[in-house]
């Protein structure tokens, strides 16, 4: 229960807090988990332990692994577990899911981007800011203390967004990067872009040859009127009416309204006896309106088929 | 789930969802019911952030709430109707990305049942 997620890239600084608090006075412990091993508290290691803080100075793949703290005091011992994953730089522009921090919202009225877990660091202004990997230009952006302010939103403005500073540790300097994403939201607090929520971008469906299996595309819409907010299917970047496939057909699932007035709609895709080919289609789920088009793409793999027992 | 149970109209009941083995800083948590012969319905979602978004149905009677220390969900039902006689189910999905329509959640609760009677 007591266990938190944490997650760095390689030669970067990493500091994780032990998910038990504890006043300051406490001694905290650092263990490996699968070894036991006390982690040293000697500045001088790479990896050290200081009070409620784990240092990766600078972190490796090898460090991913669980880290036990034991926050310990007269009366009694709490015990907390880090999970710390390590990954690779990446070559390219695109960053994976796993390495984002929580999605923020901003609308017109407030749109301050927090750089996740810089309190743990030792840093000094300025922050750098990117936006899906360009530095950050203009007169609109103002770095500020720990976050970023964005002057007049649009919903262009959307986006994944990498701070950048340095930790300092007894003199020594050490990047850190840390990424999450940006959504503009209405006054009445929802993305005016189309959401998809389901299918997961890039997700693999797995299917059984010969069986019939359904796919549904669900976007939600922004508050107030939309005069044009769609949910369909393409395969292969065609619309399924001019698809041609007969046994392939999609039909407009649930729909709902919100509160607040969110829309949201389904679209299923019915796929009578799948058959091989099937699965060398690019099956695209659409959300549009006004403010734009977001899609997600499906695959099918073959799954194997289930084990009758007789 | 649990909190279920039968109710005179009008009355209130507090549901409950514990969750274990989860430890993701994105997820978004959702309140369905369904009636026999019917589809999910979604009542509440509540993310992350915190962002919380009720059904139109709802109309100001139920509130989504968690403790994250107990990795609890809950939902607070006042002023039940006869209407509102369904099994509820809670569900939660890894994005903080959030609505409650029944095709973005992955993991399902087994369900609660809550009876209204006039």
């Known amino acids: 229960k007591f266990s938190k997620q944490s997650w760095g890239l390689e030669n970067e600084a990493l500091i994780v807090r032990c998910p038990r608090q504890g006043k300051p006075s406490y001694t905290v412990d650092w263990y490996y988990s699968q070894t036991n091993k006390s982690i040293p508290t000697q500045e001088r290691n790479r990896v050290f332990a200081s009070g409620q803080l784990l240092k990766f100075l600078p972190a490796a793949v090898a460090d991913s692994g669980i880290y036990t703290c034991i926050v310990r005091s007269p009366t009694f011992n709490r015990t907390g577990y880090a999970n710390v994953t390590i990954y690779k730089k990446q070559s390219d522009c695109n960053v994976p899911d796993y390495l984002m921090y929580s999605t923020v919202s901003g609308s017109e009225k407030n749109s301050k981007i927090y750089c996740p877990t810089i309190d743990l660091y030792n840093w000094t202004a300025p922050l750098e800011w990117f936006k899906n990997c360009q530095a950050l230009q203009g007169s609109r952006y103002r770095a500020h203390k720990s976050f970023l302010v964005i002057d007049n939103v649009m919903t262009e403005d959307a986006g994944d967004y990498t701070c950048k500073f340095i930790h300092n540790e007894n003199g020594a300097n050490y990047s850190v990067t840390a990424t999450r994403s940006f959504t503009v939201k209405d006054e009445q607090g929802f993305s005016l872009f189309p959401v998809i929520g389901a299918p997961a971008q890039n997700e693999i469906k797995e299917v059984e040859i010969g069986k019939n299996a359904n796919l549904t595309c669900s976007a939600c819409f922004g508050k107030g009127t939309q005069f044009l907010a769609a949910v369909l299917w393409q395969l292969n970047g065609t619309k399924i009416t001019d698809f041609g496939e007969p046994r392939i057909q999609q039909e407009e699932g649930q729909n709902q309204s919100f509160s607040n007035g969110l829309a949201c709609l389904d679209m299923v895709l019915r796929i009578a006896d799948v058959k091989e080919e099937d699965l060398l289609l690019q099956y695209d789920c659409l959300a549009l309106n006004l403010h734009g088009l977001r899609r997600h793409t499906v695959r099918l793999s073959r799954k194997n088929p289930s084990k009758e027992c007789f | 789930e649990s909190g279920g149970g039968s109710v005179q109209a009008g009355g209130s009941l507090r549901l409950s969802c514990a969750a274990s083995?989860?430890?993701?800083?994105?997820?978004?948590m959702g309140w369905f019911r369904q009636t026999p012969g019917k589809g999910r319905e979604g009542v509440a979602s509540?993310?992350?952030?915190?962002?919380?978004i009720y059904g139109n149905f709802v109309k100001g009677r139920f509130t989504i709430s968690e403790d994250n220390a107990k990795n609890t969900l809950y939902l607070q039902m006042n002023s039940l109707k006869p209407e509102d006689t369904a099994m509820y189910y809670c569900?939660?999905?890894?994005?903080?990305?959030?609505?409650?329509?029944?095709?973005?959640?992955?993991?399902w609760g087994q369900g609660t049942q809550v009876t209204v009677s006039s």
């Open positions: 083995g989860y430890t993701y800083s994105r997820y978004c």
């Open positions: 569900a939660a999905r890894v994005d903080s990305t959030c609505a409650p329509m029944p095709s973005w959640f992955t993991y």
């Open positions: 509540i993310n992350s952030d915190g962002t919380t």
